[in-house]
């Protein structure tokens, strides 16, 4: 399961996707879209 960064800090538990608040500004990943700060 993947770990995605997301600056609103919510978690999608059923997919085990955890979004963290830090490092969003670094944009180290591809923008997921239709969310806040999510990159992967």
């Amino acid at each position: 399961d993947a770990e995605f960064r997301h600056d609103s800090g919510y978690e999608v538990h059923h997919q085990k996707l955890v979004f963290f608040a830090e490092d969003v500004g670094s944009n180290k990943g591809a923008i997921i879209g239709l969310m806040v700060g999510g990159v992967v």
Epitope: G9, Q15, I31, I32, G33, G38, V39, V40
Partner: antibody, heavy 121, light 111 residues
Framework: QVQLVQSGAEVKKPGASVKVSCKAS????????IHWVRQAPGQGLEWMGF????????NYNQKFKGRVTMTRDTSTSTVYMELSSLRSEDTAVYYC??????????????WGQGTLVTVSS | DIVMTQSPDSLAVSLGERATINCRAS??????????LNWYQQKPGQPPKLLIY???KQGTGVPDRFSGSGSGTDFTLTISSLQAEDVAVYYC?????????FGGGTKVEIK
């Protein structure tokens, strides 16, 4: 300008696999995930999943788990969606798409033209 | 998974009149004061087009006659003055959780 150009229509037999391509241009390929959405004839929209051209990580709709694989080729800025064990219910137009995040100064979407996959014996 | 339900299935409205489409989510699509609810327009033979994101914000280049409202589980798309070019199917979609999900669509026609 941003463009997503998909491969042509396919006709497949039940049990076969299909691989649809989506070639991106007009932006830095690795900066946006590519999503796949399908639409059966006369029906609604169904999200299949996405893949990251940056990391190669994919996330799939559990409905398709085990049957769908999304990959990318950064050398050609192309994303692929492969669906296996095809059945008649998989007959649909398959779209690739790119979306902005809410926190951009602007938010819009870009879609491929669609690829019709017909599953018939 | 979050289930999105739209009503009505179809709607016939006179030119210049208001069209209202409803969307209900099986659970809240809000998080941190943001509603992760989007609306799309799809015309025959074309891919969908994003109209409204985050429940109330207009997508790039979307005419002002399209507006969105609501929060939590209940949302509305309003076309304030229907134009001939607005004939299409409209879909709501949640992007709070994977898998993203769409409503069944509402077909808007001219009366």
């Amino acid at each position: 300008q941003v463009q997503l150009v998909q491969s042509g229509a396919e006709v497949k037999k039940p049990g076969a696999s299909v691989k649809v391509s989506c070639k991106a241009s007009g932006y830095t390929f690795t900066t946006y995930a590519i999503h796949w959405v399908r639409q059966a004839p006369g029906q609604g929209l169904e999200w299949m999943g996405f893949t990251s051209p940056y990391s190669g990580v994919s996330n799939y709709n559990q409905k398709f788990k085990g049957r769908v694989t999304m990959t990318r080729d950064t050398s050609t800025s192309t994303v692929y969606m492969e669906l296996s064990s095809l059945r008649s219910e998989d007959t649909a137009v398959y779209y690739c798409a790119r979306f902005d995040n809410y926190d951009r100064g602007y938010v819009r979407d870009y879609w491929g033209q669609g690829t019709l996959v017909t599953v018939s014996s | 998974d979050i289930v999105m339900t739209q009503s009505p299935d179809s709607l016939a409205v006179s030119l210049g009149e208001r069209a209202t489409i409803n969307c209900r989510a099986s659970e809240s699509v809000d998080n941190d004061r943001i509603s992760f609810l989007n609306w799309y327009q799809q015309k025959p033979g074309q891919p969908p087009k994003l109209l409204i994101y985050a429940a109330t914000k207009q997508g790039t280049g979307v005419p002002d006659r399209f507006s969105g409202s609501g929060s939590g589980t209940d949302f509305t798309l309003t076309i304030s003055s229907l134009q001939a070019e607005d004939v299409a199917v409209y879909y709501c979609q949640q992007s709070k959780e994977f898998p993203w999900s769409f409503g069944g669509g509402t077909k808007v026609e001219i009366k």
